[in-house]
Every structure is written in structure tokens, then in C-alpha cells.
């Protein structure tokens, strides 16, 4: 059980999960083609930042991440992926402190974008009330970014 | 059993707009993506978009300024529509669910042909 | 985009013997051991049917003459032995990557 004691450590940890390559992958009848893995992310976008507008206008006192952008596309593989696994235990960790209905269904795309065989790391939120929302918000902010990343490295290529 | 059927006008004048309609049966729109193709007149197929199970649309490059494809989950339709048509766009059209990831397009509509001519 | 070409634009084959399609994909259309190419049948009238999905598994329903393999960028649709129903347009098609696009189809006739 990872515990933080605030949204440096998580955006640290999480940016460390991004940048770490992958060396498993989906068994072949589960492995989605760029195409496949571009609709998902489409979907993913307006549900991502729907969440974070709406955190951010109910939060108003909790002030914005200008944390770096995360390093969420694995260097090593073209097309480019979005690495799933590392960002589900936050979204689970989350889900009963935010919009459940919205935090399912994300969950359930990145599900579809999952490495099989990989193990998921549980994650505690901060107790502190004030660094819970933080944390939260660090979480959605981070995600946003990675989304946009991911969807212009999938639309730059030979199109 | 699955059933995709088209309809619309048969003749667009040029510069007008072409709105065409697929209706489907035995499957809800809030599940798969849906998709429009055309075969032009020597046999060539092109893929047009989709309208996903969210309403979520996506189009192809060559088609993105004059296309736009929508629904009404309600009648379990969705729609094409292509302005500014030219007689290029001449084609048979047709729609096509592509119910899984990773998978093809596995139920198709019989296709509704437009001429566009004055 | 990537380019499909198929090969050749016209077959004509004998009742029982063997009909060979081939495709050609300007990039590979690989990932993690799959190929995203299906191929389709369109017969006169009708509406494209899925016979082939990611290059070598077949669509329920579809009789096991029909046949497609190969990887990357080299796909082959065999049809053996062809029968009278066979006549026919086939079409190969990619889903690796946006926009999908297809192959300028082969005609298929009994001689």
C-alpha cells in the first residue's frame, strides 16, 4: 500500500510510472491497433475534462497544479501507448471522493487499454482534507494532459 | 439478426447537401461505433466516419470540412451529412457497424446510390 | 494514409480449382502478433459481407474454402476450391490505423 502526504509525491510517483517502459503486453487477441486505441482516447477526452472543469468549478479554493506534464507515451513502442495500468489505482483510489458515474466509465476505457498480466498498485488518498482535494485535482490535471499527448502523437503520424 | 438500412434522396443537385439516414434493428446505437462508406462508381470503396455508442464522432481527413454524421438514439438512426456536394460524390452509400475492438466490420446496410446532377 | 493494393483487378478460375488474391499494405498493419486486415465478398446488388477478419480468422457462417493469411504487409485471400456462388468482387481493408482504407477490390469470374 502506497500512502502520500500530498500531490508532489503522487505526481511524482505517477510521473516515475510514466516514464517506466513497458515489457509486458496484452495477450495478441486483446492488443488494440492505434486505431482501435484512438477511439478510446476519444472518448476518454471530453469525460476527462468534464470532470476536471466540474472539480474545478465545485473546488474553487484549491489552488491549480503547474506540475510538469507527464511523460505518459512509452518511448520504446510505435505507436505510441498510453500507460494504463499506471494510472488506474488513482482513478479506483478517487472514485468514491468524486463523480462515480464519470470515474466508471473511464475506468471501464482504460480497462480496454490495460496491459494484461500487470499488476495494479493500490493507493491510499491523503487524509487531510485540503490535501485530498489537492490530490484529486492533481490526478484529473495530470490526466488531461496526458490524454491531449497521447491523442497528438496518435495524430501525427502518416495520416 | 442485425439490420442496417439506408435511405434518402436518390439525386443532390451540385452544391447542395446530401442527408442520408441508417436505420438499424436488432442492436441499440448506445452500444458499438457506426459507421458511413461509399463505393464510387469504379468500384472504389472509401471509409466516411463513425458516431460511436457515446456520440462521439470521427471523420476522415478528406472528407472532415463537409462532413458530419449524427443520431437520434431514440429511433435508433443515425445520420450522414456531406455539403457542398459535387459530382465526385456521386456514390452508392452505405452504412456498417463495427461492434468490437479489434474486430471488422461485420453487418453492412444493402447501400443507397445518389447522383449528384443538375 | 495507408495504401491497399490489390492484385490482380481480375480472375477468371475454373469451378474446383484455386482462386489466390493477394494484398499489398504500404506499412505494416501488425501489432503484438495481429494483423488488422479483414477481406470482404461483395456480390452484384448486394452489400459487402466480412468473410475474413484480421487476416486469417473466419466470420461465422462463412464456408472453410475460404481462406486468408499472411502478416505486416503481405496478405493473401485463397478461395479453393471456387464454386459458382464465388462470383464475385473481393475487397481487403485495414483498421490498423485512421483513416481505414481499402483495397481497389478484385473480380472474381468462372471460366
Known amino acids: 500500500m502506497l500512502s502520500h502526504t500530498g500531490p508532489s509525491r503522487f505526481a511524482l510517483f505517477l510521473l516515475c510510472s510514466m516514464e517506466t517502459l513497458l515489457s509486458s503486453h496484452m495477450a495478441p487477441t486483446h492488443q488494440l491497433p492505434p486505431s482501435d486505441v484512438r477511439k478510446i482516447i476519444l472518448e476518454l477526452q471530453p469525460l476527462s475534462r468534464g470532470l476536471l472543469e466540474d472539480y474545478q468549478k465545485k473546488e474553487t479554493g484549491v489552488p491549480e497544479s503547474n506540475r510538469t506534464l507527464l511523460l505518459c507515451l512509452t518511448s520504446d513502442s510505435q505507436p505510441p501507448r498510453l500507460n494504463s495500468s499506471a494510472i488506474l489505482p488513482y482513478f479506483r483510489a478517487i472514485r468514491p471522493l468524486s463523480d462515480k458515474n464519470i470515474i466508471d466509465k473511464i475506468i471501464e476505457q482504460l480497462d480496454k487499454l490495460k496491459f494484461q498480466h500487470e499488476p495494479e498498485t493500490e493507493i491510499s488518498v491523503p487524509a487531510d482534507t485540503f490535501e485530498c482535494k489537492s490530490f484529486i485535482l492533481t490526478i484529473l490535471q495530470q490526466f488531461s494532459a496526458c490524454l491531449e499527448s497521447v491523442f497528438k502523437s496518435l495524430n501525427s503520424g502518416p495520416q | 439478426e442485425v439490420q442496417l438500412v439506408e435511405s434518402g434522396p436518390s439525386l443532390v443537385k451540385p452544391g447542395g447537401s446530401l442527408r442520408l439516414t441508417c436505420s438499424v434493428t436488432g442492436d441499440s446505437i448506445t452500444s458499438g461505433y457506426w459507421n458511413w462508406i461509399r463505393k464510387f462508381p469504379g468500384n472504389k470503396l472509401e471509409y466516411m466516419g463513425y458516431i460511436s455508442y457515446s456520440g462521439i464522432t470521427d471523420y476522415n481527413p478528406s472528407l472532415k470540412s463537409r462532413i458530419t454524421i449524427s443520431r437520434d438514439t431514440s429511433k435508433n438512426q443515425y445520420y450522414l451529412q456531406l455539403n457542398s456536394v459535387t459530382t465526385e460524390d456521386t456514390a452508392t452509400y452505405y452504412c456498417?457497424?463495427?461492434?468490437?475492438?479489434?474486430?471488422?466490420?461485420?453487418?453492412w446496410g444493402q447501400g443507397t446510390s445518389v447522383t449528384v446532377s443538375s | 494514409d495507408i495504401v491497399m493494393t490489390q492484385s490482380p483487378a481480375s480472375l477468371s478460375v475454373s469451378l474446383g480449382q484455386r482462386a489466390t488474391i493477394s494484398c499489398r499494405a504500404s506499412e505494416s498493419v501488425d501489432t503484438y502478433g495481429n494483423s488488422f486486415m479483414h477481406w470482404y465478398q461483395q456480390k452484384p446488388g448486394q452489400s459487402p459481407k466480412l468473410l475474413i477478419y484480421?487476416?486469417?480468422n473466419l466470420e461465422s457462417g462463412i464456408p472453410a474454402r475460404f481462406g486468408g493469411s499472411g502478416s505486416g504487409t503481405d496478405f493473401t485471400l485463397t478461395i479453393d476450391p471456387v464454386q459458382a456462388d464465388d462470383v464475385a468482387t473481393y475487397y481487403c481493408q485495414q483498421s490498423y490505423e485512421d483513416p481505414w482504407t481499402f483495397g481497389g477490390g478484385t473480380k472474381l469470374e468462372i471460366k
Open positions: 484480421r487476416a486469417s
Open positions: 456498417a457497424r463495427y461492434g468490437n475492438y479489434g474486430y471488422a466490420m461485420d453487418y
